[in-house]
């Protein structure tokens, strides 16, 4: 139902929404306040829970910290004495806020706490090689919650330059697909930046000595990255893919990649890193298939088959809305959602999943919609569907409120209606009302007036009147009632006279040059305010000031100096306020015999 | 069906340690908390530990604490209780249950328990 | 801790009879008091949560109602099956706690 804007003074209360909560994912830092967001609209007054892995997590209660819980909000911030503090925070939390009418819950919140990074202390070996051959300088950067930037620099902090020859993997390993004695370094040292922590760390120095030789052989290329032949991956649509070969050989190696499947989408691919790595920006479904790289130098060549699956995370075809239904009503809500692999779809009520609710209850599911019938106050609740597949959670709180409203008639009381016999008169009564009052037109004896053919009502509670007569004039009495109350009003019909042509204008031939005068006479309600106009092929008549073509008066039509233009249709037009009559004559203008 | 089933009950004098289990089916185990309640025999239902569904919060029974350790293997499904320095008071039957948490928080199944004996 | 006391710790009573059990917080808890039914030999079993609502598979004749610190469990119309040992349990904050017990006996 939706609660017309004319009925004042309903219902106060409000289910609990949900109306800002924290990302699913949270990386706090060493230094960060631990700020959780929840906050929820509802009437009578909501009151908020957390859980955090699967028990209810009370933050006033967190020993050696300082919690600040904001008034009338779930939302609260934990700051710690230690810069280790938030380790002791991490997991999944999730909000439930709650009033009488049910509870709304939060999407899972994962708190991940970031530590200082640090490289494990470790031995780094020189790493000797002979010139021309391949090498591999690893960079293995510490695991971090956020994406890094790594960089490979030498101790004068001025950056290795890449090339075809030389190039930075994706995982952050150095790869010579072949090296030169100009190679020959003691630091070769890895850079990762941890955006969040405004932190760069670095790797123990690499020395690479690369031994000269006389005789540089020839090699065909070989595949540092990936090494095998064909490898499996799933990209996630509307998401970047990024596909990367890098290859060694002598002389170096160059990079082409092909798509077996069908046409590379050129306007979103973008090649870089000397053409080692293949991006495509926003993954299709069409995107699906394989991707090839082939290696080539004058020695040979080395391929590697990327097969590609286009999977994507849930999203919504239909979200279920929260509404308002009457008691008895039948209340559905849609949760149409779509993915691959295809989503799992879970209901809750008020937080709770179904499966664990009595099996008693009357709601049902069907297609992926959760219906109630015949819902009572009762009923009212906050309802929850959750998909989610391996790619990831969607989460929709939508409420069933059951409302009982007594009825109201929203037309005025005590309204006059006029209109002339023979025609329909029709008498307003909208009602409103939880459960949907019935509507009954009455008489003034109380008498159903249904039993006379003429009377006939419509949905909305107007009461139609076909083929008036004189003695429907009178007082009629519309009844609203529900379930809580009945409220009547007053309706006042006057039925008038209709107005009536008792002579219409005649036909006629005239001579051009000629006048010829129309007349027209009506007989109209005498309380009526009586109106005779003229009309000429349908548009209307008037003396024109500056013209003496045309002269009316009581209900005279004269036409002056007759003209071919002005052979036609004229008519005359009787009317009050409530009805409109018509007389049409045909005007035929000839010309005198010719000489 | 939802499952769960204690074992490694038995006699055992009183110092001395035994660990129990609870295998869990029927349900996603590593979403819920878990929970030992034990009823002495003759006696009431007396709480003593929670875990939470990933091992980050556990709590404890004051008569308990630092004796008990209770952990769980969410890749095995299973629920554990290592009861050290054990007391003629700990004997009980000892039951598992599944806590649901929402904005309200419930042991909604229960193992069939084991019987524990403390005795010389 | 939070103290749970039940009253009566026993009951005769007859089939069909109203039977209600009490129990006390020593603390407001809200409304999160669970029942649990237990029969001799066997594991306890969830009734009602969060002080009213039914639990699922449990006959409609059990009912619970109170918030803040006092409660009840009403039986409408006594059972020969409903014979057995009920308590009330808080779960408010830890340590969770229940209340000692009342044994409903035949008459």
């Known amino acids: 139902i939706q609660i017309p804007e004319e009925y004042e003074g309903h219902h106060v209360m409000e289910p609990p929404v949900i109306t800002e909560q924290s990302p699913r994912r949270l990386v706090v830092f060493p230094t960060d306040d631990i700020s959780l967001k929840c906050e929820a609209s509802g009437k009578p007054e909501v009151q908020f829970r957390w859980t955090r892995d699967g028990v209810h997590f009370k933050p006033k209660e967190e020993l050696g910290v300082t919690v600040y819980q904001s008034p009338h909000s779930g939302s609260f911030t934990i700051t710690g004495n230690n810069s280790n503090f938030a380790q002791r925070f991490q997991g999944i939390y999730r909000c439930f806020a709650s009033n009488k009418l049910g509870t709304a819950m939060s999407h899972e919140i994962r708190l991940m706490a970031e530590g200082a990074p640090k490289w494990p202390k470790e031995t780094v070996k020189p790493v000797e090689v002979e010139e021309g051959e391949s090498v591999v300088l690893p960079c293995n950067p510490p695991p971090s919650a956020e994406p890094l930037r790594i960089y490979w620099m030498n101790s004068k902090i001025l950056h290795i330059k890449q090339d075809e020859r030389v190039t930075m993997g994706q995982n952050g390993n150095l790869y010579f697909a072949n090296v030169l004695t100009s190679d020959n370094h003691s630091d070769y040292i890895c850079h990762a930046h941890f955006p969040g922590t405004r932190t760069i760390i670095q790797k123990e120095p690499i020395d690479l000595r690369v031994k000269a030789t006389n005789s540089m052989i020839d090699r065909k290329p070989r595949l540092l990255f990936p090494t095998n032949s064909s490898s499996h991956l799933v990209a996630l649509q509307g998401q970047p893919l990024v596909l990367e070969c890098i290859a060694e050989g002598f002389p170096t190696p160059t990079i082409k990649w092909l798509r077996p499947s069908g046409p590379m989408p050129a306007d979103r691919v973008t090649y870089q890193n000397h053409n080692k790595t293949l991006q495509l920006l926003k993954v299709g479904e069409e995107d699906d298939g394989e991707y090839r790289c082939l290696a080539e130098n004058s020695l040979g060549s080395a391929r590697h088959a990327y097969y590609v699956t286009v999977e994507a995370a849930p999203y919504w075809l239909h979200k279920p809305q929260s509404h308002l239904y009457g008691p008895g009503e039948t209340a559905r809500l849609d949760c149409q959602v779509q993915g691959r692999p295809q989503p799992e779809v879970t209901w809750r009520i008020n937080g709770i999943p179904v499966e664990e609710l009595a099996k008693d209850q009357k709601y049902r599911i069907q297609r992926g919609a959760l219906i109630l019938s015949n819902v009572q106050p009762s009923d009212t609740m906050v309802t929850q569907c959750e998909a989610r597949n391996r790619h990831g959670l969607l989460l929709a709180n939508a409420y069933i409120y059951v409302v009982q409203l007594p009825a109201k008639i929203l037309t005025a009381d005590n309204q006059t209606y006029m209109a002339v016999q023979g025609s329909t008169a029709y008498l307003l009564c909208k009602a409103f009302g939880a459960p949907v009052p019935s509507v009954q037109w009455l008489d003034e004896d109380g008498t159903t007036v249904l039993q006379d053919e003429r009377f006939f009502p419509y949905a909305n509670g107007t009461l139609g009147i076909r083929d008036l007569q004189a003695n429907d004039t009178g007082r009629y009495f519309c009844l609203a009632a529900n379930d809580q109350n009945n409220v009547t009003i007053m309706a006042n019909l006057k039925v008038k006279d209709a107005t009536q042509i008792t002579q219409g204008p005649r036909s006629t031939i005239e001579k051009k040059g000629s006048r010829v005068t129309f007349t027209c006479q009506a007989s109209f309600d005498p309380s009526l305010q009586p109106s005779i106009t003229w009309r000429g092929d349908g548009r209307d008549l008037q003396e024109l000031g500056d013209s003496d073509k045309y002269f009316i008066e009581d209900g005279r039509l004269v036409i002056h100096s007759l003209d071919y233009s002005d052979q036609g249709n004229y008519s005359c037009v009787a009317s009050t306020e409530l009805d409109v009559v018509e007389s049409r004559a045909q005007l035929l203008v000839v010309g005198s015999p010719g000489p | 069906e939802v499952q769960l089933v204690e074992s490694g009950g038995g006699l055992v004098q009183p110092g001395g340690s035994l660990r129990l289990s609870c295998a869990a089916s029927?349900?996603?185990?590593?979403?819920?908390?878990m929970n030992w309640v034990r009823q002495a025999p003759g006696k009431g239902l007396e709480w003593v530990s929670a875990?939470?569904?990933?091992?980050?919060?556990?709590y404890y029974a004051d008569s308990v604490k630092g004796r008990f350790t209770i952990s769980r293997d969410n890749s095995k499904n299973t629920l554990y209780l290592q009861m050290n320095s054990l007391r003629a008071e700990d004997t009980a039957v000892y039951y598992c249950?599944?806590?649901?948490?929402?904005?309200?928080?419930?042991?909604?199944?229960w193992g069939q328990g084991t019987l524990v004996t403390v005795s010389s | 801790d939070i103290q749970m006391t039940q009253s009566p710790s026993s009951l005769s009573a007859s089939v069909g009879d109203r039977v209600t059990i009490t129990c006390r917080a020593s603390?407001?808890?809200?409304?999160?008091l669970n029942w649990y039914q237990q029969k001799p030999g066997k594991a306890p079993k969830l009734l009602i949560y969060?002080?009213?609502s039914l639990q699922s598979g449990v006959p409609s004749r059990f009912s619970g109602s109170g918030s803040g610190t006092d409660f009840t469990l009403t039986i409408s119309s006594l059972q020969p099956e409903d014979f057995a040992t009920y308590y009330c349990?808080?779960?408010?904050?830890?340590?969770?706690?229940f209340g000692q017990g009342t044994k409903v006996e035949i008459k």
């Open positions: 249950a599944k806590q649901s948490t929402y904005f309200y928080s419930y042991f909604d199944v």
């Open positions: 029927g349900f996603t185990f590593s979403d819920y908390a």
């Open positions: 875990i939470s569904s990933t091992g980050s919060t556990i």
């Open positions: 603390q407001s808890i809200s409304r999160d």
């Open positions: 969060a002080a009213s």
């Open positions: 349990q808080q779960s408010y904050s830890t340590p969770y706690t």
